[in-house]
Amino acid sequence: EEELQVIQPDKSVLVAAGETATLRCTATSLIPVGPIQWFRGAGPGRELIYNQKEGHFPRVTTVSDLTKRNNMDFSIRIGNITPADAGTYYCVKFRKGSPDDVEFKSGAGTELSVRAKPSAPVVSGPAARATPQHTVSFTCESHGFSPRDITLKWFKNGNELSDFQTNVDPVGESVSYSIHSTAKVVLTREDVHSQVICEVAHVTLQGDPLRGTANLSETIRVPPTLEVTQQPVRAENQVNVTCQVRKFYPQRLQLTWLENGNVSRTETASTVTENKDGTYNWMSWLLVNVSAHRDDVKLTCQVEHDGQPAVSKSHDLKVSAHPKEQGSNTAAENTGSNERNIY
């Protein structure tokens, strides 16, 4: 009678993570008597996957009933496959022995490859805000994919970026891989509504790439421009001075009026108007009683924006020639800012 052969007909099997892998194995003879074992890997460091004699295998089932006397099908199924299951599996026939069974013949092996989807890309920006014209770095990370081949692209508002560096780790063989990319983005004043997108394409995604996004509103700081103007006289001996704070982002802003260097009022921007580009405008005014002053008055609008050093704009108010009343300025009255007379 011809000597027993162990046949593993599939050189390789490709399975998606989470699915079941079937590893086929048949013997050509019932002799010699002895159990079958499945191993992953070869040599002394191999891992026992299934033992016909004993053991508990929550994820492994046999395709046929191994207890039947004439059974020669030793195929197994491994459920809930993960990238860690990748490797070459060997079906090994043992000959009954005493005290131990003796390895008799091994199949040629079946290489199990696992396709695993990358995790949703996570995009993170710089820890601190930056102003227009500055270059900031964004990182994108995705993990757990297999095989190693993967494509990553960066976009800003739909336009592909070219200034980025990408690494896939580890460099050598692994059960699964991670990708890490850093892109450089130059900020502009119009970027409050902009988005940076990291797009990952992988064979497991069937042409439907995964995307991670970051809003530049979390990254950008647009400093305000200031303009101080003197309004027409509202009443005898009173002058209305306004400070226009324009095109700033984010909204966090504190304004202080100084009269000849002395603080007269501090207020926080509340009722702001939003521009189309996402920046904000705000106006504050000061009602100055010029009759209380003998000399010219230097009025300063000082703005502290988003915790940055204060910027200021000054206006010299001449008190030598008191202007005559020119009627009320309704536009100034309706701005909603707090009025205060200076005495």
Epitope: R40, P44, G45, E47, L48, G55, F57, P58
Partner: nanobody, 124 residues
């Protein structure tokens, strides 16, 4: 060289549960098959449970089947033994063991490394 450190032992009542942990260091954990053994006073050390390096195959001594569960976390270099429905006869020092090769219940003689043990006492 592999260092093994058991924890989680203690004194419990019959019928209670206990989970033992063993942390391994000094070698790639995912290349090691792991096992638990125990030694009661005046008795030989006996096999309790074993688990292959990926965790796909597990082995239990007959008297522990259905009550004890072995598991591992390769990311944390940990192997666990969950013990339910404990009996006074489960009182022993429980040892964690690591093997470079693993042949099911042959694990006791294949174990290359041993921990110091953790005492489990089950009172009636």
């Amino acid at each position: 060289q592999v260092q093994l450190q058991e924890s989680g032992g203690g004194v419990v009542q019959a019928g209670d549960s206990l989970r033992l942990s063993c942390v391994a260091s000094g070698r790639t954990f995912s290349s090691l098959d792991m096992g638990w053994f125990r030694q009661a006073p005046g008795k030989e050390r006996e096999f309790v449970a074993g688990i292959s390096r990926s965790g796909i195959s597990q082995y239990y001594a007959d008297s522990m089947k259905g009550r004890f569960t072995i598991s591992r976390d390769n990311a944390k270099n940990l192997v666990y033994l969950q013990m339910n429905s404990l009996r006074p006869e489960d009182t022993a020092v429980y040892y964690c063991a690591a093997a470079l090769t693993f042949r099911g219940s042959d694990l006791p003689r294949d174990s290359n490394y041993w921990g110091q043990g953790t005492q489990v006492t089950v009172s009636s």
